[in-house]
Amino acid sequence: IWELKKDVYVVELDWYPDAPGEMVVLTCDTPEEDGITWTLDQSSEVLGSGKTLTIQVKEFGDAGQYTCHKGGEVLSHSLLLLHKKEDGIWSTDILKDQKEPKNKTFLRCEAKNYSGRFTCWWLTTISTDLTFSVKSSRGSSDPQGVTCGAATLSAERVRGDNKEYEYSVECQEDSACPAAEESLPIEVMVDAVHKLKYENYTSSFFIRDIIKPDPPKNLQLKPLKNSRQVEVSWEYPDTWSTPHSYFSLTFCVQVQGKSKREKKDRVFTDKTSATVICRKNASISVRAQDRYYSSSWSEWASVPCS
Amino acid sequence: RNLPVATPDPGMFPCLHHSQNLLRAVSNMLQKARQTLEFYPCTSEEIDHEDITKDKTSTVEACLPLELTKNESCLNSRETSFITNGSCLASRKTSFMMALCLSSIYEDLKMYQVEFKTMNAKLLMDPKRQIFLDQNMLAVIDELMQALNFNSETVPQKSSLEEPDFYKTKIKLCILLHAFRIRAVTIDRVMSYLNAS
């Protein structure tokens, strides 16, 4: 058993049929010595008396808010949560496996630039009685500070019969140099509590590996005389690291109809303009990627050909 | 200890092309190592990230773009003195800081070159003959060093009398290649910045 936060404790249980469970001793936070009784949750049934209560925690029915009272007055609470371990593996029931970039990816993180700011998100089908708490650091043995905000519900989607909820959090490395060469990864730890179930999820990455620029901005078209060709120009996204001559991007320019199966024109360039062949009912799209370290491409920025 | 906006002569900054080739070569070599050594811990997640130039050179700091010198987090206290001549310095107006930066890059390349050559000598003794260093990568390091054209003491190639541990050597190769790729990215950024200045 360990303390998650004040008056909240996590009991780690090996989860299998007829498991013995864990013996837990609760102590009432009071100078009082006698006349103390214990109850669980909203029940008025007295579980025991005395300053300490010893319980055998085996299942979720044994978890919950234990309260010690004296003469009708509440003295203190202890909330017990369960963390299940099945076949030596901690449970991952609360969050959905996003399977990208690989299986068992519960947390996904992205950074728009090298400033040390990044966003992580996760998915769940659970809608109520759910709380998250996020901590982060650079490195684990001698951790350097990363400050994370509160996790918030950022999107709701319908997937078949299920509703899916996306939560996200923004974090900022306390003293980040955009030009630095990372040798210690960022560690992100998410504590998830659903009702009386506790789970924790972690992700470890270098900012350079989670870079995904914003789409290029200000796409403009200029038809070329006596030609099917169009000159398309754009600018670096505002959120990208500066100076741009140091943090350079490369671009992919594509002309395509509405269907992915349609024919297309595609060209790659390090410049902020390109010449492509425009077709009726097609769109010109441009996306960006770090020129020197191939992490993710940005989303497409698009304009219609006409 | 940063790069002011220098004004090299018109035309291609001589080292940009070489630095692009360097990044390509080390990326290809790293990809080859990952594929060939698939049963060794050779991915970014699996290896320890070590920098053999740590406390010996200060390329990131010496080559910091002017725009980042206002960022306190970028101003490391490490100071290193370097020799200040070099053929990539295409203009007389080139500052002392730029010379410091380029000479730090040269020292990086020299250290990696020695490490890679020592390692290759060991890998050539491996009866499995599983992996060797790409001669193209070694040639590209050499070309960039020549383009930088700094005079400095030659570092003797390390020779080891004991029987090499090929497993450890291959893991060290992965560690070196990952670190060198990151440094090659920095070098490419620096050359691109200087070329644009």
């Epitope: 199966r261 349609e262 024919k263 297309k264 024109d265 595609r266 060209v267 790659f268 390090d270 010449t275 | -």
Partner: antibody, heavy 118, light 107 residues
Framework: QVQLVQSGAEVKKPGSSVKVSCKAS????????LHWVRQAPGQQLEWMGW????????EYAPKFQGRVTITADESTSTAYMELSSLRSEDTAVYYC???????????WGQGTLVTVSS | DIVMTQSPLSLPVTPGEPASISCRAS??????LHWYQQKPGQAPRLLIY???QSISGVPSRFSGSGSGTDFTLTISSLQPEDFATYYC?????????FGQGTKVEIK
């Protein structure tokens, strides 16, 4: 299986014209760009131009502009390349090639040898 | 027009040995570079597109690398069927242009 089948070899006199055909099978004809590329004996490949069979849009290499005409007949899934004012240096194997991507070629015809000789 | 220069023009190789063919563009073309193989009396065949992207059905011993002006086609271990002429082609701008070709011959 996508295939491009070209018309047979031709012998032409200088100053005349030649029209080579390229019939496509497999896949929808208008879903692909169609190009013509030639190769003189022992020489490198030389791109001549492309057509979008969907709308008849064409683009030609400046070297052949005014001398080459590329057309397409959607009803027969056939593209044509006509080269006029032939000279001896136009002796070459003419290939049609196609792709959903405009700028490179993933399926090629077998080639048509055009010999220009007096 | 962008001029593509291949080297060497002729490359004698022992079967089983690796081979590398270089292609240089007269100006930067990013990764807009494609490789083809041509055997005598046959049409070219696409091997690699956009500098390094492999084509399904093409053996994995063929790989491409490069960007900007310098590109390389590598055959990791030459098989008897690989003796042919190889062409690079740029698609950065029209007109599309090819290299002169590199003939890989049996040593």
């Amino acid at each position: 299986q996508v295939q491009l089948v070209q018309s047979g070899a031709e012998v032409k006199k200088p100053g005349s014209s030649v029209k080579v055909s390229c019939k496509a099978s497999g896949g929808t004809f208008s879903d692909y760009y169609l190009h013509w590329v030639r190769q003189a004996p022992g020489q490198q490949l030389e791109w001549m131009g492309w057509i979008d069979p969907e709308n008849g849009d064409t683009e030609y290499a400046p070297k052949f502009q005014g001398r080459v005409t590329i057309t397409a007949d959607e009803s027969t899934s056939t593209a044509y390349m006509e080269l006029s004012s032939l000279r001896s240096e136009d002796t070459a194997v003419y290939y049609c090639a196609r792709n959903k991507e405009l700028r490179y070629f993933d399926v090629w015809g077998q080639g048509t040898l055009v010999t220009v000789s007096s | 027009d962008i001029v593509m220069t291949q080297s060497p023009l002729s490359l004698p190789v022992t079967p089983g040995e690796p081979a590398s063919i270089s292609c240089r563009a007269s100006q930067s073309i990013s990764i807009n570079l494609h490789w083809y193989q041509q055997k005598p009396g046959q049409a070219p065949r696409l091997l690699i597109y956009f500098a390094s992207q492999s084509i399904s059905g093409v053996p994995s011993r063929f790989s491409g690398s490069g960007s900007g002006t310098d590109f390389t086609l590598t055959i990791s271990s030459l098989q008897p069927e690989d003796f042919a002429t190889y062409y690079c082609q740029q698609s950065n701008s029209f007109p599309l242009t090819f290299g002169q070709g590199t003939k890989v011959e049996i040593k």
